[in-house]
Every structure is written in structure tokens, then in C-alpha cells.
Amino acid sequence: IWELKKDVYVVELDWYPDAPGEMVVLTCDTPEEDGITWTLDQSSEVLGSGKTLTIQVKEFGDAGQYTCHKGGEVLSHSLLLLHKKEDGIWSTDILKDQKEPKNKTFLRCEAKNYSGRFTCWWLTTISTDLTFSVKSSRGSSDPQGVTCGAATLSAERVRGDNKEYEYSVECQEDSACPAAEESLPIEVMVDAVHKLKYENYTSSFFIRDIIKPDPPKNLQLKPLKNSRQVEVSWEYPDTWSTPHSYFSLTFCVQVQGKSKREKKDRVFTDKTSATVICRKNASISVRAQDRYYSSSWSEWASVPCS
Amino acid sequence: VPGGSSPAWTQCQQLSQKLCTLAWSAHPLVGHMDLREEGDEETTNDVPHIQCGDGCDPQGLRDNSQFCLQRIHQGLIFYEKLLGSDIFTGEPSLLPDSPVGQLHASLLGLSQLLQPEGHHWETQQIPSLSPSQPWQRLLLRFKILRSLQAFVAVAARVFAHGAATLSP
């Protein structure tokens, strides 16, 4: 058993048929010595008396809010949550496996630049009685500070018969050094509580590996005289790290016909312009990627040819 | 470059960008099979990193690029030694199309651009590499190349910025 926060405790249980469970001793937070009784949740049934209560925690029915009273007055509470371990593996019932980039990916994170700011998100099908708390650091043995906000519900989607809820959190490294080569990864820890079930999820990454620039901005076409060619131009996204002579991007320019089956013409360039042939009803798209480190490409910025 | 003269920023830029490309193309081509039960004990902790105080940020380069260039030079020599060690020359053989050889030669080329014959910087003591067990080598290659990708990315940014803003 360990304390998650004041008056909230997590009991770690090996979950298998006829498991003996964990013996837990609760102590009433009071100077009183006698006349103390214990109840669980809203029940008025007295579970025991005395300053301490010993219980055998085997299942969710044994978890909940234990309260000690004296003469009708509440003295203190202890909320017991369960953390299940089945076949040596902690349960992951609350969050959905996003399976990208690999199986058992519950948390996904992205950064728009090297400033030390990043966003993480996760998915669940649970809509009520759900709380999240997020902590982060750079490194684990001698952790350096990363400050995370509160997790918020950022999207709701219908997937078949199910509703899916996306939560996200923004974090900022306290003393970020954008130009340095990271040697210690960022660690993100999410505590998830659904009713009386506790689970924790972690992710470890370098900012460089989760970089995904915003799409290029101000995408424009300039027709070239007496030609089917156009000059496409664009700018670095506002959110990208500066100076651009140091934090450089590379770009992919694509000409795509109306039909998905039509052949795509692609050009790669380090410049912020390119000359391409504009076909009727086609569109021109541009996306960006760090020039020197192959992290994710941005989403496409697009304009129609006409 | 040792002693304060300027490097050939544009040449360094071109070669460092080539190094980035090679480091990424070498990464999947490091052995005969997938990484599997090799375990994840930390094996590349001792590689030199370009850290916050090394003056490799735009402001530090403007103030005095020598600190940063020396750091990059140390790293290039370090990785050049690693790529020549039995981690890469031993079994499992590199795949026939592996660009590790080109990568190795380019590391040497860039380090020589930064320190021409006859000039000497204090080089960081290269740890003497004890022979590696064949079963460890795939994981070591994987980690070294991942680490090298990060190192050369920073070096390439430095030279790109230098070529754009510090070239005579």
C-alpha cells in the first residue's frame, strides 16, 4: 500500500482466483483513543472499533472510502483504490491502446518545435468517474523539472457503437535548451483513476523524436508566363524554432489530381519555393520536416491549382 | 581552425548534411536479424553529447565558435573510432548495402576539415573499447547509430547557421 495523495491510498493486488489479497491496517487521524468506529462508503454498518482497523483487501468491494467516527462526528477518511496485477502485468483497462507507433502505446506526445513545450494525449471509452493527474521530468535518476498543466477533455468521437474520449495535457520543460543534443529522455507519468481502480501509464522520449512541425504557412501559387508551370511559395510556420538558418526545415511538394488513383508528382526541396506543373483540377500540397533529423512530417498545407 | 581561424563553413555544411542522410540510411542496415532478446542495458552512455554549455547555440556561435567546434570535433573522432571498432567490423557482418563504410569515411572527412594536418586540439580521451560479444553488437550498433543521428543533426545545424551567418 502507498499514498497517492493526502488520504488516498493505492493497494497493489495480485489478481487471480482465490488470491489471498493484502492485509491493510488503517489508522484514524485523531488524538482520540477510544469510542472510535469505522464505516465504508455510505453504509452505516460498523466494520470495527478502535483507533486502527485491519482489513483484508481482495476485490473492489473491499475498496472505497473508509471513515472513522466518534459520537456521530467524522474524524478522518481514507480512500482505498486498487491497482490490479494479472500474470505479473499491471492492468491497462482505463486507456485505449493507440497501437501507433507500436502496440501498447497508451500515451502519444508531439512537439511543434524545440522549445521544450510538448502535448500528450490519450484515449478512453469511459465517460464518468474518471480523473487524471500528470507528472513529468527530464531523466529519472536526477530528474530535471518539467511543468504540466491539468489534463482536459480535448475531443469526443463516435467509433462504431462506442464513444471515444480524447484527453490531452500540455507540458513545458523548465530550463529547456533547444540547441543542445538531448542525452536524457523526458519521462511522462499519468495516474488514471476510474471509480476505485487505479492505473498508471508512462512514456519516455526525446523531444527530437516527437517533433512534428505545423504545416507551412502562406502557401501561394504564381503562374509562369507562357507555361503550364507555376511557382509555389510558402513560409516557415510561426510555431517553428528560430533562427531558421539554424533550425532548418526541408519540404515536400506534391501535385495531386482530383482522383486519389492519379499519380502524385513529388519534389523535395530545402528552399521555400518550387516550380511544378499545375494540372487541371489538381491541388498542390506542401509539408515540412526537420532538415537534419527524420522526425514526423507536418500535415499538408494545400491550395487548388485553378 | 585550432587557434581561432574560421572553418570552411560551407564545406562543413555540405558534409554534415551528407552525414545526416547517411546516419539515417545506415540505421536499419546494421545486421543479420531483428533486435530481439538483447536487453536494454545502457550501452552508449559514454558518448560525447553537445550540451547546453558548449556554445553550439546561435548566440554561442556568434560569441566564439571555437568551443562548439572543438566539441563537435571530439564527437566526430569518438564516433569515427566506434564505427571502426569490432562493434561494426565484427560479426554479424553488415548488410551488403549498408552505408556504414561511407558514414565512417565522412566522419573522418569532416573531422579533418575541422582539424587540418599539423593542427591539434586537445582531444577528449577516447575510452579504449573492449571487445564486444557478437550477441551484443546488433543492439550496440542500433544505439550508436541512434545517438549519432542526434549528434550529427546538431552539428549540421551549427554548420548551416555558420555558413549562413558567419562565413566571410
Partner: antibody, heavy 115, light 107 residues
Amino acid sequence: EVQLQQSGPELVKPGASVKMSCKASGYTFTTSIMHWVKQKPGQGLEWIGYINPYDDVTKYNEKFKGKATLTSDKSSSTAYMELSSLTSEDSAVYYCVRRWDEAYWGQGTLVTVSA
Amino acid sequence: DIVMTQSPATLSVTPGNRVSLSCRASQSISDYLHWYQQKSHESPRLLIKYASQSISGIPSRFSGSGSGSNFTLSINSVEPEDVGVYYCQNGHSFPFTFGSGTKLEIK
């Protein structure tokens, strides 16, 4: 074409030393480790050790430490093995091998230790 | 040291028959196991690398299988020129060790 050309047979007296060579051609010498293997007449194979010609790092089978010394010369793309304090137990064919998984063995050097 | 045990010590086969040679390692060596053929007065020749990977120039009748500590070299239709001693080798960890060999004879 990759070739490993070993030096010729040696007849040596007990207590003496012998140094044999293995000249590599058809590839860049510094890109592969070179193993040495011993085979006594009518018997099996025993690994002696290897050298990485790029940095001259060596690894020996404990059994051959103090007996065998591996060296290399980049300029001539040649690997060497010196055997010291020879006894009749050292009479064998010695092979140089470029990496186990690359199918290149020298033709062997026969060493005969006899008074 | 990892001990490599080969069986049988000698095998006498009729041309055209399929034959299997066994090699056991005293501890797991994953798939870091190589097979060699040595004919009289010749250098050993690599037949199979990493337990099951074929070598260019080696006839397709030679194949390898196994992982961990049990390995097999199969010759699916023995030819008279296959006579010789077959060695397996631990390529996993130091010191590299060889089996004592299986001698293949033709009836």
C-alpha cells in the same frame, strides 16, 4: 575477389618462436576482424583469438594468452600471428578467417615443432 | 565456456538419402550457430550461418534449423562429394567454440 593468402609451412625447434602471415586482398582490410583458428592433425578446430585491424584491438581465447600474439599491418593489408615457446602440442595447421559469417578462410599454415 | 556437442560422431549414408546432423549447445546461443564442411586436406567451408541462413555458392540441398541450444544440419539428397567432417560453431560469445565434428561417409 576476396582472398586470404597465408605464409608457407614452418619446421621449428621446441622453445623457439614462429611468426606466420595472412595477406588479405579483394576488400578493405580495416573493415573486418580477422580470426585465427588452430587444427591439430586429425583433430577438431580451436579458436585462438581475433584482431580488429582498424584499431588493433585483440581478443584472445584464455587458453592461448601468452602463447599467441596477434598483430596487423594496415599498409600491407596483412595480419600476423606469432607463437612463442613452442612445444609439440603446438604442431598444427593454423588458419586465418575473415569473420565467421563471411566464408573466407586462408589455406592454412602448417607448423611442425620437432627437435 | 559453451560446449558444443555433435552427434553422431560418424554417419554412413547411401547417396540420394536425406541425412540430419545434430548439434547441441550447453547454453542458449540464440541463432548464432554456424555450420562448416571440411574435406580432407582442405580449409573448412562455411555451409550455413546463423542457424538457417544459406550461403551463396553452397548447394541448396544443405539447410539448417534450430534456435537456442538445439540445431540441425540437413542434407536432403546426399551426393558422393559430401564426404567430409561437419563442424558446428558457437558464434554467440567468447571463447568461440566448435563441436568435435560429425564424419560423413558414403556407403
